[in-house]
Interface confidence: low
Amino acid sequence: AQEVQQSPHCTIAPVGGSVNITCSTSGELHGIYLRQLGPQPQNIIYYEDRVVPTTDKRFQGRIDFSGSQDNLTITMHHLQPSDTGTYTCQAVTEINVYGSGTLVLVTEEQSQGLHRCSDAPPTGSALPVPPTTSALPALPTASALPALPTASALP
């Protein structure tokens, strides 16, 4: 079955700092969205192998990628308090599959000691239920996507 492993569950960074979020996917995959959850979920990036990544204006110039779409590490730089939130990986496949989420806490230097990450993945209010399909960006159907060559056949 298709699944997305996402790590870490929680990370704390100072204002101006950086965080890494890793999305690992098994099975057939067309691409990866990183979405910031909340009342109005926002797409942060879309990444697809051999494709120019799309980055939300708010994060342009602050995002780096390493790895490939099935094992992608997204680095967010120059963090601001407004970047605090839960970020989830969304695998674009026949159906939409979500990672467990990463809670990113961006703190002022003086309040760093007040914040702790537990070992458990974010749940409940920290990780809203993935938005309904109608709230998702329209995605091409599988039949509309080019057939992807196997990894060994990739140039």
Epitope: G31, E48, R50, V51, V52, P53, P140, P146, P149, P155
Partner: antibody, heavy 129, light 107 residues
Amino acid sequence: EVQLVESGGGLVKPGGSLRLSCAASGFSFSVAWMSWVRQAPGKGLEWVGRIKRKTDGGTTDYAAPVKGRFIISRDDSIKALYLQMNSLKTEDTAVYYCTTDPLLRYSDWLSHSLMGDVWGQGTTVTVSS
Amino acid sequence: DIQMTQSPSSLSASVGDRVAITCRTSQNINNYLNWYQQKPGKAPKPLIYAASSLQSGVPSRFSGSGSGTDFTLTISTLHPEDFATYYCQQTYSIPLTFGGGTKVEIK
């Protein structure tokens, strides 16, 4: 306007060297894979090689006839692509085009659409004694 | 390397004709195939990507079909500006390879 402009072509003797440049504008050059394609007089198109974007390792691939003689490089800070041609042969005579790699695909939040490959106007390289 | 066999190498047609150009590959490339149009002294112009998707700004009289090893570029109604040379290209594996071209001439 999305544009690629090649320069550096000219007449060179067999065994000589030449460096072609390609200046990009109007698009995010640093995230593009870039290729060189050539066309000998009266002949078809021949892929020369390509360079990936830095986030994909910036690695290069070459066609067999030029491997070991040609070197593709890029300078993202000035949106420039280069083709260093060494040990030139008469059969390297051609118009050389700089292009965005045809695998380059832009996506937005609502759809997935391919940006039309961008091609320069070409620069002519003549290898003759 | 993947070999690209384009046919015919040239054809004569009249304005208003329907024209079909075929491209056969030496191995399965799924739909990783592009079509280009080139006029004398000009750079190639992308027409079709992923075998059947029309590039932005290309007239709808151009269409592409096929998958696997057999592909076709069709011009439903030939216009005067369509007289040119057409190339297919596979982007499935390195080295990227082009077909030999099909020159569409005025009858």
